[in-house]
Interface confidence: medium
């Protein structure tokens, strides 16, 4: 369909509430440092303009693309260069280069303080102005996560509002709110990481990589749907995510709603697990479909070998329509293996493709590819063994100890990476234990490897901004599906020149005593990374001793009448102690 005015079309499709929310998210993801009020002003102006276009699509500027309209709005901000530096240079470009330039300036690690929920203050804000409260939530999440999946953020904002509607009535607001907010926070962070990986796969590895990922995932989830159906959904889904990752949030949300409608209208041929999703309102419906439980496998699936090994026409099929044939293979293999991670399924498909590429050029292709399925076993065994070993380590050490083991492992592999990044990534890698090790055997592999893909993507995104390690660059850029095996295979870097010992790194203050437990852990883990950068060959025993002494030193000073005085006296002694242990 062609519309005279795209902005009018989107406003009518989405309705005023969602339109405003999405415009607010779009501006917040681009201008991450602007105060909320500034964004509200921009949103108000854009909304008023959209309404004039709805009334008369021929009105002045209504025929401009949304990129042009949004870009013009951003570039009209007087303090743009002052607050955002070279982002202002984008304004000298024409569309579509200007929009590309804005996208490149999104900051995955903005210097914005962590949100600390204060139940009393938040309830007061909520009761004073619900609309502003909803907007503020969108703003705070969007500016911290510039690639957050916008229509999904609208969903989380509704849940957030519901939590406050319930808890602000409660006698003990904090007891009601805090666990719910924490639970929601975990969901939101996971959603942010999932979307960041989707955007990275589209932007760094192309649309085909994203389609392959989606094909495998959807085939696992909807094994009763046939290949045609899955292919159609994959194509539509790729369009939706391409738009959101590209900052076209209005189009993305509109297309996502259309896709949810299509899936619900055709649920009989897609999955038996969608019934309750399809009875929900739009945002909940889309979220529910995305999180839908796996359908049961059809009972009458034929052995894969029939079509992909025993059939004498394999090479003809492969040569004449490579993508369709390999797509069919990935679909058939994935629907039969809900227990495999998506990355593993894609690795298997790659081996199958490489084998056919090789064998179909030979004299006797069927004899050459007859054993292709045997090649898959080592690919399956590698992550399974790795997960088994790491889960055993997690059971033995507990979450904090397991994180520390990973900090040691990864600091030795890539000591050039910044300390905050190593701490963040190793801590997140360590959470795989509590997330996945307690799961039933058949869920462990997909849980662990798919989660590790999210965390390693975070490392890749942060590292790309300031590249310091060739090893990290290699693992991040060579192959999306082999990132995890690539990082697992890294050995300690023997070429690394140890850092000088900087006493200030190990200077602590009284504030340590009042920090929440997780922040206390981060301080200790930061010291551990710095220690390893100074002494990369420190033994496990030495590190254990230092950490033990550190805990004792902190405990002692936090129990002393004058915390700060104790840290001032005991701190230097502790540093001497460390140097002695590591000498």
């Amino acid at each position: 369909d062609t519309y005279k005015s795209e902005i009018a079309h989107r406003f009518k499709d989405l309705g005023e509430q969602y339109f405003k929310g999405l415009v607010l998210i779009a501006f917040s993801q681009h201008l991450q440092q602007c105060p909320y009020e500034e964004h509200v002003k921009l949103v108000r102006e854009v909304t008023e303009f959209a309404k004039t276009c709805v009334a008369d699509e021929s009105a002045e500027n209504c025929d401009k693309s949304i990129h042009t309209l949004f870009g013009d709005k951003l570039c009209a901000i007087p303090s743009l260069r002052e607050h955002y530096g070279d982002l202002a240079d984008c304004c000298e470009k024409e569309e579509p280069e200007r929009n590309e330039c804005f996208l490149q300036h999104k900051n995955d690690n903005p210097d914005i303080p962590k949100l600390k929920p204060d139940p009393v203050a938040l309830c007061a804000d909520f009761q004073e102005d619900e609309q502003k409260f909803w907007g503020k939530y969108l703003y705070e999440i969007a500016r911290r996560h510039p690639y957050f999946y916008a229509p999904e953020l609208l969903y989380y904002a509704i849940i957030y509002k519901d939590v406050f509607s319930e808890c602000c009535q409660a006698a003990d607001k904090a007891a009601c709110l805090l666990p719910k907010i924490e639970h929601l926070r975990e969901k939101v962070l996971t959603s942010a990481a999932k979307q960041r990986l989707k955007c990275a796969s589209i932007q760094k590895f192309g649309e085909r990589a994203f389609k392959a990922w989606s094909l495998a995932r959807l085939s696992q989830r909807f094994p009763k749907a046939d290949f045609t159906e899955i292919s159609k959904i994959v194509t539509d889904l790729a369009k939706v995510h391409k738009e959101c990752c590209h900052g076209d949030l209005l189009e993305c949300a509109d297309d996502r709603a259309d896709l949810a409608k299509y899936i619900c209208e055709n649920q009989d041929t897609i999955s038996t697990k969608l019934k309750e999703c399809c009875d929900k309102p739009l945002l909940e419906k889309s979220h529910c479909i995305a999180e839908a439980k796996r359908d049961e496998l059809p009972a009458d699936l034929n052995p894969l070998e029939h079509d992909f090994v025993e059939d004498k026409e394999v090479c003809k099929n492969y040569k004449e329509a490579k993508h369709v044939f390999l797509g069919t293979f990935l679909y058939e293999y994935s629907r039969r293996h809900p227990d495999y991670s998506v990355s593993l399924l894609l690795r298997i498909a790659k081996i199958y493709e490489a084998t056919l590429e090789d064998c179909c050029a030979k004299e006797d292709p069927p004899a050459c590819y007859a054993t292709v399925f045997d090649k898959f076993q080592p690919l399956v065994d590698e992550p399974k063994n790795l997960i088994k070993q790491n889960c055993e380590l997690f059971e033995k050490l507990g979450e904090y100890g397991f994180q520390n083991a990973l900090i040691v492992r990864y600091t030795k592999k890539v000591p050039q990476v910044s300390t905050p990044t190593l701490v963040e990534v190793a801590r997140k890698l360590g959470l795989v234990g509590s997330r996945c090790c307690k799961r039933p055997e058949e869920e462990r592999l997909s849980c662990a490897e798919d989660y590790l893909s999210l965390v390693l993507n975070r490392l890749c995104v942060l590292h790309e901004k300031t590249p310091v390690s060739e090893k990290v660059t290699k693992c991040c850029t060579e192959s999306l599906v082999n990132r995890r095996p690539c990082f697992s295979a890294l050995t300690p870097d023997e070429t690394y020149k140890p850092k000088e010992f900087v006493e200030g790194t190990f200077t602590f203050h009284a504030d340590l005593c009042t920090l929440p437990e997780d922040e206390k852990q981060i301080k200790k883990q930061t010291a551990l990374v710095e220690l390893l950068k100074h002494k990369p060959h420190a033994t496990e025993e030495q590190l254990r001793t230092v950490l033990g002494n550190f805990a004792a030193f902190v405990q002692k000073c936090c129990a002393a009448p004058d915390h700060e005085a104790c840290f001032a006296v005991e701190g230097p002694k502790f540093v001497i102690e460390i140097r002695g242990i590591l000498a």
Epitope: D311, N317, V324
Partner: nanobody, 126 residues
């Protein structure tokens, strides 16, 4: 569900021609891998020709290569088998079979096709 209905069979002299049709309903024929099989009296079902779903890749049994042509008309949702230079050994009931979901693969294994027509008899005799 896919329903298939064959037509066009009959008696023909050796060296003659026939065109079989298979009308599909419940599914678009271009989304489906489809094939013709035949069954001579007292024998098992034998693959004759096939065409891939979504991609027009054709397949033929060695015994019919160069004589038979498989095709489809997506607008009519119909599959065809043009049979030329017919021989007495081509006498059989001809069945149309479908594998939905656009598996590009047209298998020669009858068991892999969930949907079948009721068949049309072709007799080649002088």
């Amino acid at each position: 569900e896919v329903q298939l209905l064959e037509s066009g069979g009959g008696l023909v002299q050796p060296g003659g021609s026939l065109r079989l049709s298979c009308a599909a309903s419940g599914r678009y024929i271009d989304e489906t891998a489809v094939a013709w099989f035949r069954q001579a009296p007292g024998k098992g079902r034998e693959f004759v020709a096939g065409i891939g779903g979504g991609v027009d890749i054709t397949y033929y049994a060695d015994s019919v290569k160069g004589r038979f042509t498989i095709s489809r008309d997506n607008s009519k949702n119909t599959l065809y088998l043009q049979m030329n230079s017919l021989r007495p050994e081509d006498t059989a009931v001809y069945y149309c079979a479908a594998r939905p979901g656009r598996p590009l693969i047209t298998s020669k294994v009858a068991d892999l096709y969930p949907y079948w027509g009721q068949g049309t008899l072709v007799t080649v005799s002088s």
